[in-house]
C-alpha cells in the first residue's frame, strides 16, 4: 500500500481507566494530513463515534476506559498529499491496584511514572495527563502511600505537586488522581509515581544547552557512514540524561535488531563553571528511510535535531 512503517516504543497502561494516545509525528503531521487509527492490522478503522468506548478523536485514539483485552498493536496511518506513514504502537494493559503493591516491580516504566525530588530543595512532581481537548480534567488530588497529601509543605498547582524543603521521608509511592469528564460521563484517572530522592542539585533551574546540532539538515550520500556529535553544556552537579532518539524511542532500542544506527559512549570535559558533554550517533550505512526523519538529541528538557537530506544532484 506504499505506506512507510514506523515502530514506536511500547506503552504499559493500567486497566479500568481512561487512556489516550496522540498520533503526532513531526514533521509529517505539521502539514495537511489525514490520520486514521486501526487495531491489529484490521482493515476497519477505529470508530469515530464519540459514544464508543474506543474511538478516534481528531488525531487521538481514546479509550474510555481501557480494558484488559485492549492490549495489542495499534496503527495510525498518516496520509499527506504525496506521503503515507503507518505508525505502530504496542499497548500492554495490566490490572493494577495502586494501594495493594509497590509499582516498583512493573517492567519498563516510563519517566512519567518514575520521578525524582532533590533533597533540601523546593521541587515538584508532575501528574502527566495526555488527553484530547474533548476531555475536561480536574480537580487533581495527590496521595502518598494511599493517603491524601495535606500540609504546609505541599501545594497543588496545575498538574504539579509542589514540595517545599524536600526530605528523605518524601521518597515512596505516590499517586495523582484526576476526574476526566467526556460527553457528560465521568471517569477516574489514577497515575502511580515512584519517587526517589537525590542529594545532587540537578534541576536547579538551569537548563542544559545543546551547542550542536541546531535543528538543521545534513546532506549525506546514500550508503555512506555518518557520525554526528551532540555537544551539550550543563552544570557540574546536573542529573540530566543525554541521549539520541528517533520517533520518541532511544536509537539503540529502535534499531535493536539491525544495530545499523547506534548511540556512542558519552564523554565530557570539565570546565570551572560547567561540563561539556559529547554523545554521538553513528549511521553505519545511511539508508533511504533515514532521510527526512528528525534524529533528536535530548539533554534533560532540551532537544535539538538533525534531518538527513540527499545532496542536490550535480549537473556539471
Amino acid at each position: 500500500d506504499g505506506c512507510k512503517d514506523i515502530f514506536m516504543k511500547n506503552e504499559i497502561l493500567s486497566a479500568s481507566q481512561p487512556f489516550a494516545f496522540n498520533c503526532t509525528f513531526p514533521p509529517i503531521t505539521s502539514g495537511e494530513v489525514s490520520v486514521t487509527w486501526y487495531k491489529n492490522s484490521s482493515k476497519i478503522p477505529v470508530s469515530k463515534i464519540i459514544q464508543s468506548r474506543i474511538h478516534q478523536d481528531e488525531t487521538w485514539i481514546l479509550f474510555l476506559p481501557m480494558e484488559w483485552g485492549d492490549s495489542g498493536v495499534y496503527q495510525c496511518v498518516i496520509k499527506g498529499r504525496d506521503s503515507c506513514h503507518r505508525i505502530h504502537v504496542n499497548l500492554t494493559v495490566f490490572e493494577k491496584h495502586w494501594c495493594d503493591t509497590s509499582i516498583g516491580g512493573l517492567p519498563n516504566l516510563s519517566d512519567e511514572y518514575k520521578q525524582i525530588l532533590h533533597l533540601g530543595k523546593d521541587d515538584s512532581l508532575t501528574c502527566h495527563l495526555h488527553f484530547p481537548k474533548s476531555c475536561v480534567l480536574g480537580p487533581i488530588k495527590w496521595y502518598k502511600d494511599c493517603n491524601e497529601i495535606k500540609g504546609e509543605r505541599f501545594t497543588v498547582l496545575e498538574t504539579r505537586l509542589l514540595v517545599s524543603n524536600v526530605s528523605a521521608e518524601d521518597r515512596g509511592n505516590y499517586a495523582c488522581q484526576a476526574i476526566l469528564t467526556h460527553s457528560g460521563k465521568q471517569y477516574e484517572v489514577l497515575n502511580g509515581i515512584t519517587v526517589s530522592i537525590t542529594e545532587r542539585a540537578g534541576y536547579g533551574g538551569s537548563v542544559p544547552k545543546i551547542i550542536y546540532p541546531k535543528n538543521h539538515s545534513i546532506e549525506v550520500q546514500l550508503g555512506t557512514t555518518l557520525i554526528v556529535d551532540c555537544n551539550v553544556t550543563d552544570t557540574k552537579d546536573n542529573t540530566n540524561l543525554r541521549c539520541w532518539r528517533v520517533n520518541n524511542t532511544l536509537v539503540d532500542d529502535y534499531y535493536d535488531e539491525s544495530k545499523r544506527i547506534r548511540e556512542g559512549v558519552e564523554t565530557h570535559v570539565s570546565f570551572r563553571e560547567h561540563n561539556l558533554y559529547t554523545v554521538n550517533i553513528t549511521f553505519l550505512e545511511v539508508k533511504m528511510e533515514d532521510y527526512g526523519l528528525p534524529f533528536m538529541c535530548h539533554a534533560g528538557v532540551s532537544t535539538a535535531y538533525i534531518i538527513l537530506q540527499l545532496p542536490a544532484p550535480d549537473f556539471r
Partner: antibody, heavy 120, light 112 residues
Framework: QVQLVQSGAEVKKPGASVKVSCKAS????????MNWVRQAPRQGLEWMGM????????RLNQKFKDRVTMTRDTSTSTVYMELSSLRSEDTAVYYC?????????????WGQGTLVTVSS | DIVMTQTPLSLSVTPGQPASISCRSS???????????FYWYLQKPGQPPQLLIY???NLASGVPDRFSGSGSGTDFTLKISRVEAEDVGVYYC?????????FGGGTKVEIK
C-alpha cells in the same frame, strides 16, 4: 458562564482592616483556588495569595503572611480576603482571579476589582 | 522570588504594523516536564487584566491569532502581527513555576 463579582469600594483609616468579598458563579466553587491580586495606582500587578474553598489550603505571598486572612462561605460561593493593619501604601485595586482550568494555570477569570483607599 | 523584567517600558505603534514585547525571568521557567510556566496578560484601560497566552505559546480562548508567544526558558517574546486600536493597554508577563506567583512591571502600548 464563569463570573466573579466583588464588593464595592472602601475607604479606611491607617491601622484599620478591610474585608473584600468575591462571589463566584458558573462553575463548581470548591474545585478551584481563588487567587487575590492587587494593583496600586499606576503600578503593576502583585499576587497576594490563593485560597482553596474547601478551607484547608491557604498559600500567601510572604509579604502579606501576617496581615492577610482568606475565608469562605460555601453556601453563597463567596471568598473573603481580609487585610489588617492598613497603611497608605495598601491603597490599591484588589482583584480576585480564577485559573483557566483545573490543570492549566493563568488567570482567565477576574473580578471587576475593589478599590480600597487608605487615608487619614 | 522569581523576578520578571519587561522591555520596553512603553511602545508607540502604528495601526497595521507589527509590535514586539520582551520579558526575562531570573530563573528558567521551563520545567523538567517540558512545560514552560509563563503567561502574558493585557490590561485595557479601566478593566481587569485578561489572559492572552498561557504556557509560553498557547493562545487563550477568544484571543485573536494576531497575538503569538515564543521564547526559551528565560527569555520570552509577545508578538502582535498587526496592531489594532483595541490592542492598547498595559501588557504584563507572569510566571507560575513556583510561589509566590510574580508579574513583570508592564509595557504600555499606545497607538501613534
Amino acid at each position: 458562564q464563569v463570573q466573579l463579582v466583588q464588593s464595592g469600594a472602601e475607604v479606611k483609616k491607617p491601622g484599620a482592616s478591610v474585608k473584600v468579598s468575591c462571589k463566584a458563579s458558573g462553575y463548581t466553587f470548591t474545585n478551584y483556588y481563588m487567587n487575590w491580586v492587587r494593583q496600586a495606582p499606576r503600578q503593576g500587578l502583585e499576587w497576594m495569595g490563593m485560597f482553596h474553598p474547601t478551607g484547608d489550603v491557604t498559600r500567601l505571598n510572604q509579604k502579606f503572611k501576617d496581615r492577610v486572612t482568606m475565608t469562605r462561605d460555601t453556601s453563597t460561593s463567596t471568598v473573603y480576603m481580609e487585610l489588617s493593619s492598613l497603611r497608605s501604601e495598601d491603597t490599591a485595586v484588589y482583584y480576585c482571579a480564577r485559573t483557566t482550568s483545573m490543570i492549566i494555570g493563568g488567570f482567565a477569570y477576574w473580578g471587576q476589582g475593589t478599590l480600597v483607599t487608605v487615608s487619614s | 522570588d522569581i523576578v520578571m523584567t519587561q522591555t520596553p517600558l512603553s511602545l508607540s505603534v502604528t495601526p497595521g504594523q507589527p509590535a514586539s514585547i520582551s520579558c526575562r525571568s531570573s530563573k528558567s521557567l521551563l520545567h523538567r516536564n517540558a512545560i514552560t510556566y509563563f503567561y502574558w496578560y493585557l490590561q485595557k484601560p479601566g478593566q481587569p487584566p485578561q489572559l492572552l497566552i498561557y504556557q509560553m505559546s498557547n493562545l487563550a480562548s477568544g484571543v485573536p491569532d494576531r497575538f503569538s508567544g515564543s521564547g526559551s526558558g528565560t527569555d520570552f517574546t509577545l508578538k502582535i502581527s498587526r496592531v489594532e486600536a483595541e490592542d492598547v493597554g498595559v501588557y504584563y508577563c507572569a510566571q507560575n513555576l513556583e510561589l509566590p506567583l510574580t508579574f513583570g512591571g508592564g509595557t504600555k502600548v499606545e497607538i501613534k
